[in-house]
């Protein structure tokens, strides 16, 4: 199998993001800088590397972005929390994938992830987290394009 199944409701995640997108992007103080947006690296990922890159980007959001953001308002926090929980569930799915040796990380995949981390590190932590949250739709669109998404009830 070249692709691993992501068994989660992507539509629900996209809805949650759309509800907070404007509020998040309004806080972006570096509109001309991008972390994921113009990533040709994401566009040229080979099918063989999709699982690895997905796994790495989920970890990037869960371990860095969702922990570094400094949003104090419950209205936004509830949505971020909902997205984070969905990402944790997706990580669990991909872990099973790894156990079946279907999520090998080749150098190209590792390089693509490193570019994203490097972009993130070039900004102050709060600014980087806000920007990455604001670019969540780039990652979600990429997942939709590259995975056979099975909607779970």
């Amino acid at each position: 199998l070249r692709r691993c199944l992501i068994s989660t409701d992507m539509h629900h995640i996209e809805e949650s993001f759309q509800e907070i997108k404007r509020a998040i992007q309004a806080k972006d103080t570096f509109p001309n800088v991008t972390i994921l947006s113009t990533l040709e690296t994401l566009q040229i990922i080979k099918p063989l590397d999709v699982c690895c890159v997905t796994k790495n980007l989920l970890a990037f959001y869960v371990d860095r972005v969702f922990k570094d953001h400094q949003e104090p308002n419950p209205k936004i926090l509830r949505k971020i929390s909902s997205i984070a929980n969905s990402f944790l569930y997706m990580q669990k799915t991909l872990r099973q994938c790894q156990e079946q040796r279907q999520c090998h990380c080749r150098q190209e995949a590792t390089n693509a992830t490193r570019v994203i981390h490097d972009n993130y590190d070039q900004l102050e932590v709060h600014a980087a987290a806000i920007k990455s949250l604001g670019e969540l739709d780039v990652f979600l669109a990429w997942i939709n394009k590259n995975h056979e998404v099975m909607f779970s009830a």
């Epitope: 309004a26 806080k27 400094q70 949003e71 104090p72 308002n73 419950p74 209205k75 926090l77 929390s81």
Partner: antibody
Framework: EVQLQQSGPVLVKPGASVKMSCKAS????????VGWVKQSHGKSLEWIGY????????RCNQKFKGKATLTVDKSSSTAYMELNSLTSEDSAVYYC????????????WGQGTLVTVSA | DIVMTQSPSSLAMSVGQKVTMSCKSS????????????LAWYQQKPGQSPKLLVY???TRPPGVPDRFIGSGSGSDFTLTISSVQAEDLADYFC?????????FGAGTKLELK
């Protein structure tokens, strides 16, 4: 009527820990974040952190990381804060406060718990 | 962290006088998302817990007398008491909720002459 009832004053020795409670009533406990705020001897207010009673998720001010632990018991609509390795700097009144539903201002406050750290 | 600076630290007024106190933030609290200023004011009477007086810089919650007027935008805010009453003797704190950590000003103590 929304009420936040906090536990009584405590006198503790340096190095000890203390766990204080904040019992909520008059609203659906899981719908509103609970924040904790420190006030040292009549001085200004310091935000310690919040807990989302719905899922127990917490976020603390970096200054209180390793000092404060926030938890909730949904069944009794009670939020807790534990402070460890106490020093005289931790002597203060600690308030729990209910957030607005959407925004991070505090619409209701407990009466405060006075913590005195003394040998 | 966003630093909140209040002035004066104390002031003494007579009943019926107009009072103004200032709160300045080290960064703008105006959100381009909803054009709201993420600033609240609290009143703390002696021996009591703080009480919310104003949110979004100028909106009073139900039950707060209309003599309390919040104004300002960006990083410069003012709380005005149009005609001070004896029961207004208290400390007044401003608070930002634009980003974590939430921070408060050091307070303005209102005393009566």
């Amino acid at each position: 009527e929304v009420q936040l009832q906090q536990s009584g004053p405590v006198l503790v020795k340096p190095g000890a820990s203390v766990k204080m409670s904040c019992k909520a009533s008059g609203y659906k406990f899981t719908d509103y974040f609970v924040g904790w705020v420190k006030q040292s001897h009549g001085k200004s207010l310091e935000w310690i952190g919040y807990v989302d009673p719905e899922n127990g998720y917490t976020r603390c001010n970096q200054k209180f990381k390793g000092k404060a632990t926030l938890t909730v018991d949904k069944s009794s609509s009670t939020a807790y804060m534990e402070l460890n390795s106490l020093t005289s700097e931790d002597s203060a009144v600690y308030y729990c406060a209910r957030y607005d539903y959407d925004w991070a201002w505090f619409t209701n406050w407990g009466q405060g718990t006075l913590v005195t750290v003394s040998a | 962290d966003i630093v909140m600076t209040q002035s004066p630290s104390s002031l003494a007024m007579s009943v019926g006088q107009k009072v103004t106190m200032s709160c300045k933030s080290s960064q703008s609290l105006l959100s381009s998302y909803n054009q709201k200023n993420y600033l609240a004011w609290y009143q703390q009477k002696p021996g009591q817990s703080p009480k919310l007086l104003v949110y979004f810089a100028s909106t009073r919650p139900p039950g707060v007398p209309d003599r309390f007027i919040g104004s300002g935008s960006g990083s410069d805010f003012t709380l005005t008491i149009s005609s001070v009453q004896a029961e207004d003797l208290a400390d007044y704190f401003c608070q930002q909720h634009e980003r974590l950590p939430i921070t408060f000003g050091a307070g303005t103590k209102l005393e009566l002459k």
